[in-house]
Interface confidence: low
């Protein structure tokens, strides 16, 4: 079967886990987590729900270690559970790396467990309206990918790509590419999008025994990156930056400008172990806010993805596809917030706005 | 199954006033924007405002600002039109109808689910 | 706010016959466009989002378009459920406005 990737992995998310599956799942879509379970493991859970709520799951994977061992699947529906469905069986070893596949198949999810065939579990809502994966419990996940079947044979990792066409940027900093982004037929369409790609170079992530060693981009923007936000801002218009934090830095910044203002100034600081936010209005700072819901999200050397959602009275930020923050707008004349700036000590993969 | 149905039309004088209510079923309300539009009798379709609730967000045309209010009840999954200062130009089919949005992904720049309508005359 | 020029007002055409309706923006709405079809005493029902993207359930013979600030609704070849109105509507400000409409009517 011919895979192409259907969105750039996460590499290394941080569990809890919570992030975007872009355009939803769509019969063919195989969806593939490498990582390792604790040696204490008790149990883990990966749920493909509707939302960042978790009120409503389509699917809920869930192997328990206790009572010999066995996994649970169910379903969640404006948050009720549904009959659990029992497979006696566990596929998975406490400590152990492991590999597990999710295949979205037109009348049910097909399970795979380290390349081996281990349970099927029927929809029992439309797959379509999932568009969220979330991970918790007791492991380490090396990665989550998401792959096509049956669309031209391309190297997975050999670029980061989406299930539309991209054309990659001629020059470091990539003028920007339009593209379809949508969501799968029978749930509401998506917004266009504009995409900034990176061209990547083959580069060894990892090398943990048994988990085959993944290719990781190699970004190609110039730092500071500016880019138009066509239209400016507006409720529920969200921007998504990833990248890489350099092993020595001390601090980057992501701001949302309005003209000469800046409307949204987030900037995680390294050697203050905090994330800054303020609005620059005339050249003038206001009152800096830096209240985390939890601990700080950005670390040295470590990748990152960071979603902005603009609403009617705040910024919402989400790191890693975890909230992190809100932020009430100071500057009210959201349309005019117009320009995306990133700068510091990164390196950008991949910008969306 | 995701609905929407409008209700409160009726015939009013000039220059009274209206609540028309939208009550939706079928999808997580606060996720959605929710849209007015009116239909004049042979005429065409015109935006009257939006509401994404979630956010306490809306937006007005420029032909009922500061004579309509839209709000939401997110425990009743029910959007509002409050009409006053009503014209007889305001007589009109009004639809309600859904954008969706879901934390943290894109504007939906269409409208996928509408109501089947109910009709304001506005006449002395 | 933005407007969108949609044209023609009306056209006659027949069963198999491939029809263009076009709307123009005054202003830069991105590909933010949907285009819809409403028969009389009935609510619109959604063709096309984002300028060129087929929403599910809508036959194929129905396409979209962009070219800058023009929009394009195709019907590649005409079937007789498919006489109505269409609108286009953008959504590239904060107002979203629509088109005043085209009526296909069977020649």
């Known amino acids: 079967m011919a895979l192409f990737s259907a969105q750039s992995p996460y590499i290394n998310p941080i569990i809890p886990f919570t992030g975007p599956i872009q355009g939803g799942l769509q019969e063919g879509l195989q969806v593939t987590l490498q990582g390792t379970t604790k040696s204490f493991a008790q149990r883990f859970v990966v749920n493909f729900q509707n939302s960042f709520n978790g009120n409503d799951i389509a699917f809920h994977f869930n192997p328990r270690f206790e009572e010999g061992g066995y996994v649970v699947c169910n379903t969640k529906q404006n948050g009720q559970w549904g009959p659990e469905e029992r497979k006696m069986q566990m596929p998975f070893q406490k400590g152990m790396p492991f590999e597990l596949c999710f295949l979205v198949q037109r009348s049910e999810f097909k399970v795979m467990v380290n390349k081996k065939f281990f349970v099927q579990y029927q929809h029992r809502v439309p797959y379509h309206l999932v568009d969220t994966i979330a991970v918790s419990g007791c492991l380490k996940l090396s990665f989550i990918t998401f792959q096509n079947s049956a669309a031209p044979v391309q190297h997975v990792f050999s670029t980061l790509q989406f299930s539309q066409p991209v054309q990659f940027p001629r020059t470091p900093k990539g003028r920007k590419q339009k593209t379809q982004n949508f969501r799968p037929a029978h749930q509401a369409p998506m917004a266009q999008t504009t995409i900034h790609m990176v061209h990547s170079t083959p580069g060894q992530m990892f090398s943990t025994p048994g988990i085959p060693p993944v290719v990781y981009p190699t970004p190609a923007y110039t730092i500071p990156f500016y880019t138009p936000i066509p239209n400016g801002l507006y409720p529920s218009k969200s921007i998504m930056i990833s990248g890489n934090v350099l092993p020595d830095a001390t601090r980057f910044h992501i701001n949302l400008r309005c003209g000469g203002d800046i409307a949204f100034h987030l900037n995680p600081r390294f050697n203050e172990n905090a994330v800054v936010r303020n609005t620059q209005i005339n050249n003038s700072w206001g009152q800096e806010e830096r209240s985390l819901l939890g601990r700080m999200p950005f670390s040295r050397g470590q990748s990152f993805s960071v979603w902005i959602i603009c609403e009617g009275h705040c910024f919402k930020v989400a790191v890693n596809g975890q909230h992190m923050c809100e932020y009430y707008h100071r500057l009210k004349n959201l349309q005019d917030i117009n320009t995306l700036e990133v700068a510091g000590d990164i390196q950008l993969t991949h910008v969306q706005t | 199954e995701v609905q929407l149905v409008e209700s409160g039309g009726g015939l009013v004088q000039p220059g009274g006033s209206l609540r028309l209510s939208c009550a939706a079923s079928?999808?997580?309300?606060?996720?959605?924007?929710i849209h007015w539009v009116r239909q004049a009798p042979g005429k065409g379709l015109e935006w009257v405002a939006l509401?994404?609730?979630?956010?306490?967000?809306?937006q007005y045309a420029d032909s009922v600002k500061g004579r309509f209010t839209i709000s939401a009840d997110t425990s009743k999954n029910t959007a509002y039109l409050q009409m006053n200062s009503l014209r007889a130009e305001d007589t009109a089919v009004y639809y309600c109808?859904?954008?969706?949005?879901?934390?943290?992904?894109?504007?939906?720049?269409?409208?996928?689910?509408w109501g089947q309508g109910t009709l304001v005359t506005v006449s002395s | 706010d933005i407007q969108m020029t949609q044209s023609p007002s009306s056209l006659s055409a027949s069963v198999g016959d491939r029809v263009t309706i076009t709307c123009r923006a005054s202003?830069?709405?991105?590909?933010?466009v949907a285009w819809y079809q409403q028969k009389p005493g009935k609510a619109p029902k959604l063709l096309i989002y984002?300028?060129?993207s087929l929403y599910s359930g809508v036959p194929s013979r129905f396409s979209g378009s962009r070219s800058g600030t023009d929009f394009t609704l195709t019907i590649s070849s005409l079937q007789p459920e498919d006489f109505a109105t269409y609108y286009c509507?953008?959504?590239?400000?904060?107002?979203?406005?629509f088109g005043q409409g085209t009526k296909v009517e069977i020649k």
């Open positions: 109808a859904r954008v969706g949005t879901t934390y943290p992904s894109r504007y939906l720049e269409a409208l996928d689910y």
């Open positions: 079928g999808f997580t309300f606060s996720s959605y924007v």
């Open positions: 509401i994404y609730s979630s956010g306490g967000y809306t």
């Open positions: 202003q830069s709405v991105s590909s933010a």
């Open positions: 984002s300028a060129s």
């Open positions: 509507q953008q959504f590239g400000s904060s107002l979203p406005t």
